[in-house]
């Protein structure tokens, strides 16, 4: 098909982060077209010669795909017609980080938008009471992080207190030699208090809370990706 008249269509991307070894999504939406056969989606990566992915005439066109993305990409084919050009990236690698461009061609015109994609490892921490210790101790563990994060303890009762003197954090390299297991131990814990173990790197921030009373232990954890509107 051809484009008659110069029109620019709106393309929107969202910065996101990928967890290495897992699948990731590079988000991109555009003004939809009536005919699927008139839509071309091209994903490019800065510094890469071949295409990350191309979808045209209703199907994948991978003849120009770069070797580093071979067999790892897919668009949501059934959602292209409604303006979803998001890319699914399988088995995210550390080297997938960088600037991507979502380039769209339709019968209405062309448009593109860039996207910053960060890669690393992040996981939920779990906080437990360490009954093996000689004093009341909490142990915070998270299985996969990269780059190396910072770990900070906080408490509801002693707000603003610095626990660095009564805590010890270690990082153990996992078998794939990239990600690390995070273990942090907090000593001299008091009953009837809520403690938070906060793990953070430039990609994600995760918090594990534990409420310790004489009668029960309550746990809660959550993870938030940084610099991402997702």
């Amino acid at each position: 098909f051809g484009i008659s008249g110069r029109h620019s269509i709106t393309v929107t991307t969202v910065a996101s982060a990928g967890n290495i070894g897992e699948d990731g999504i590079l988000s991109c939406t555009f003004e939809p077209d009536i005919k699927l056969s008139d839509i071309v989606i091209q994903w490019l990566k800065e510094g890469v010669l071949g295409l990350v992915h191309e979808f045209k005439e209703g199907k994948d066109e991978l003849s120009e795909q770069d070797e580093m993305f071979r067999g790892r990409t897919a668009v949501f084919a059934d959602q292209v017609i409604v303006g979803n050009a998001s890319l699914r990236l399988k088995n995210v690698q550390l080297t997938d980080a960088g600037t991507y461009k979502c380039y769209i061609i339709t019968s209405k015109g062309k448009g593109n938008a860039n996207l910053e994609y960060k890669t690393g490892a992040f996981s939920m921490p779990e906080v437990n009471v360490d009954y093996n210790a000689s004093s009341e101790t909490l142990r915070c563990e998270a299985p996969r992080w990269f780059p190396q994060p910072t770990v900070v303890w906080a408490s509801q009762v002693d707000q603003g207190a610095n626990f660095s003197e009564v805590s010890n954090t270690s990082f153990e390299l996992n078998s794939e030699n990239v990600t690390m297991k995070v273990v942090s131990v907090l000593y001299n814990v008091t009953i009837n208090n809520t403690y938070s173990c906060m793990i953070e790197n430039d990609i994600a921030k995760a918090t594990g809370d534990i409420k310790v009373t004489e009668s029960e232990i309550k746990r809660r954890s959550h993870l938030q990706l940084l610099n991402s509107k997702a």
Epitope: E46, G47, T95
Partner: antibody, heavy 117, light 105 residues
Framework: EVQLVESGGGVVQPGRSLRLSCAAS????????MNWVRQAPGKGLEWVSA????????YYADSVKGRFTISRDNSKNTLYLQMNSLRAEDTAVYYC??????????WGQGTTVTVSS | SYELTQPPSVSVAPGKTARITCGGN??????VHWYQQKPGQAPVLVVY???DRPSGIPERFSGSNSGNTATLTISRVEAGDEADYYC????????FGTGTKLTVL
């Protein structure tokens, strides 16, 4: 300041070899794909070769395929063009240029290669 | 292989508008870039992605692209605009147009 500086040009006999270098500064070299482009005297621009940021992927124009090799040393921020079996028609000013998506946004000042007996 | 055709020369009076065309099969679906090259100097990118201008390039330079023709438009032409102009697309390599010599009368 973003800068590309080519070197290594000169006069060489047909069939001989020459290696061009391009020193990059002012940007993260390893993140950018790079190109060599040439211009014969009084002629237009002709793309020669391209290399990905990692150096893993290379493309060549048909006119130089099998004779020229593009490479890079990211630790030295330097791009190279090894030119073997040179011909008279390879006489040109050779530019290195930074690839930016589908175009080239930064060019060096060029180095002159003359192939003559 | 893909080919881009430009007129060899375009002449224009100072203060007027110059239009340089670049023809290619269904070029409207490709991203077109334009370079200015003055004698003895390296090319300079003046328009990228059909119609966007790099920082430092005057607003007088604009581009459009549809169908089989991309166009570089230089409004209020100045003597300093006299140069060779090349269009370029990517097609498994950089493809350059044949080049157009802009003469300011």
């Amino acid at each position: 300041e973003v800068q590309l500086v080519e070197s290594g040009g000169g006069v060489v006999q047909p069939g001989r070899s020459l290696r061009l270098s391009c020193a990059a500064s002012g940007f993260t070299f390893s993140n950018k794909a790079m190109n060599w482009v040439r211009q014969a005297p009084g002629k237009g621009l002709e793309w020669v070769s391209a290399i990905s940021g990692s150096g893993a992927t290379t493309y060549y124009a048909d006119s130089v395929k099998g004779r020229f090799t593009i490479s890079r040393d990211n630790s030295k921020n330097t791009l190279y063009l090894q030119m073997n079996s040179l011909r008279a028609e390879d006489t040109a000013v050779y530019y290195c240029a930074r690839k930016r998506w589908y175009g080239m946004d930064v060019w060096g000042q060029g180095t002159t290669v003359t192939v003559s007996s | 292989s893909y080919e881009l055709t430009q007129p060899p020369s375009v002449s224009v009076a100072p203060g007027k508008t110059a239009r340089i065309t670049c023809g290619g099969n269904n070029i409207g679906v490709k991203a077109v870039h334009w370079y200015q090259q003055k004698p003895g100097q390296a090319p300079v990118l003046v328009v990228y992605d059909d119609s966007d201008r790099p920082s430092g390039i005057p607003e007088r330079f604009s581009g459009s692209n549809s169908g089989n023709t991309a166009t570089l438009t230089i409004s209020r032409v100045e003597a300093g605009d006299e140069a060779d102009y090349y269009c370029q697309v990517w097609d498994r390599g950089m493809i350059f147009g044949t080049g157009t010599k802009l003469t300011v009368l």
